[in-house]
């Protein structure tokens, strides 16, 4: 094609996580993938700094093709500001990574005391659970419904009916996952929602309770039941 | 039914390397984290190391950092521990262990399924 | 790390009789969310350990009622109420709230 263009981003959505937290000896990959007419060249700095091979032990890998930036076996030395400079002669565009290497024992995901909150609010209004997850790992985090289905909570396998409300995902940020928003509530709403995150050390999850209160003048709603999920 | 195989055991002399594996079969491998565990002959057992469930993150213990590799092939359910410059001390079996999965659990969070395990001898 | 510490070394119990294993740990192994992540495994000779209790004192699945798990923070009981013949090999205690994860240096149960 003739038409020039300067760099843009092609698929942001691999650009979300800015902050990475990585133990120590592991691999760590940083991604930019960009367009641009000319294709545009990608360079990589390290606080602000040209970023050489021979600044670190065993050097890194750029896969152009994949606009990736590749370290291997991570050590605190590693720790800082990675920022990829995507450029042509019609423009350059730049994104910032933050590198932690975590050297401390991996525990099992700390969920803040209190959160999720017990809440209650009217039909019709809105509602919000938080949940603050702290993990020296990257956690996986999902916010879980216990619902019923024909008046009972349980299956016939003794499993409780749950259903997989929010889940962290490619498309997902930490701090959107971190909030289950539920807007005008209904009866059915009301229940037990749980948080949980897992790292490969374990799962931990608090739960919390939504009252629904029937709203001014207005009669209580007739809801079909859930379906299963387990 | 769930069930961990390890492979790969043997005899090897001191320096030289050998990678053990373990087929999981039963249960939904991608969505699980994966530990090696040791144990000595004659002695207790001991954690080497664990993979996240996609294999993004992976801790080990200090007796085998830098020498151990814990990696795992989703696709194919199978678990693996490339073991370099191996030490006479590194002589045991070795058990392949179901760790936490990725959901809500009603039981243990893992440690609750692990293989029959695998010889490794290490000696001159 | 989390040193784990079992007493005794060996125990020889009559069948039908109860026994009693204590293991301590050198930190609190109760987690924010309130559950204490101490398990206890059986291996009996020639097999790998096989789960009997997790979260200090939840029984898995198929495991005999005989077995009961109990402690808080830092210091753990198993108890069995009647040992059986099948209750020979090796107890061990675990803490599962953070990497390395480690395990008492076990309690070898034999029968009188």
């Known amino acids: 094609s003739n038409n020039k263009r300067a760099p843009y981003w092609t698929n942001t959505e691999k650009m979300e996580k800015r902050l990475h937290a990585v133990p120590a000896a592991n691999t760590v990959k940083f991604r930019c993938p960009a367009g641009g007419n000319p294709m545009p060249t990608m360079r990589w700095l390290k606080n602000g700094k040209e970023f050489k091979q021979e600044h670190r032990i065993g050097g890194y890998k750029v896969r152009n093709q994949h606009w990736s930036l590749i370290m291997e076996s991570v050590v605190p030395s590693d720790k800082g500001n990675y920022t990829c400079v995507v450029e042509n002669e019609y423009g350059s565009i730049n994104h910032t990574y933050h590198l932690d290497v975590v050297e401390r024992s991996p525990h099992r995901p700390i969920l803040q005391a209190g959160l999720p909150a017990n809440a209650s609010t009217v039909v019709g209004g809105d509602v919000e659970f938080v949940c603050k997850v702290y993990s020296d790992a990257q956690p996986h985090i999902q916010w879980i419904k216990h619902v019923e289905k024909n008046g009972s909570k349980y299956g016939p396998d003794g499993l409780p009916y749950l259903k997989v409300l929010k889940a962290a995902g490619v498309n997902t940020t930490d701090k959107e996952i971190e909030v289950l928003y539920i807007r005008n509530v209904t009866f059915e709403d009301a229940g037990e929602y749980t948080c949980l995150a897992g790292n490969s050390i374990g799962i931990s999850f608090h739960s919390a309770w939504l009252t629904v209160l029937p709203a001014p003048g207005r009669e209580k709603e007739i809801t079909a039941s859930p379906d299963y999920l387990e | 039914e769930v069930q961990l195989l390890e492979s790969g055991g043997g005899v090897v002399q001191p320096g030289r390397s050998l990678r053990l594996s373990c087929a999981a079969s039963?249960?939904?491998?991608?969505?699980?984290?994966m530990h090696w565990v040791r144990q000595a002959p004659g002695k207790g057992l001991e954690w080497v190391a664990v993979?996240?469930?996609?294999?993004?993150?992976?801790y080990y213990a200090d007796s085998v950092k830098g020498r151990f590799t814990i990696s795992r092939d989703n696709s194919k359910n199978t678990l693996s521990l490339q073991m370099n410059s191996l030490r006479v001390e590194d002589t045991a079996i070795y058990y392949c262990?179901?760790?936490?999965?990725?959901?809500?659990?009603?039981?243990?969070?893992?440690?609750?399924?692990w293989g029959q395990g695998t010889m490794v001898t290490v000696s001159s | 790390d989390i040193v784990m510490t079992q007493t005794p070394l060996s125990l020889s119990v009559t069948p039908g009789q109860p026994a009693s294993i204590s293991c301590k740990s050198s930190q609190s192994l109760l987690h924010s969310d309130g559950k204490t992540y101490l398990y206890w495994y059986l291996q009996k000779p020639g097999q790998p350990p096989q789960l009997l209790i997790y979260e200090l004192s939840n029984r898995f699945s198929g495991v005999p009622d005989r077995f009961s798990g109990s402690g808080s923070g830092t210091d753990f009981t198993l108890k069995i109420s009647r040992v059986e013949a099948e209750d020979v090999g090796v107890y061990y205690c675990m803490q599962y709230i953070e990497a390395p994860l480690t395990f008492g240096g076990g309690t070898k149960v034999e029968i009188k």
């Open positions: 039963g249960f939904t491998f991608s969505s699980y984290a």
């Open positions: 262990v179901r760790g936490a999965g990725r959901g809500y659990t009603y039981g243990p969070d893992g440690f609750d399924i």
């Open positions: 993979i996240s469930y996609d294999g993004s993150n992976k």
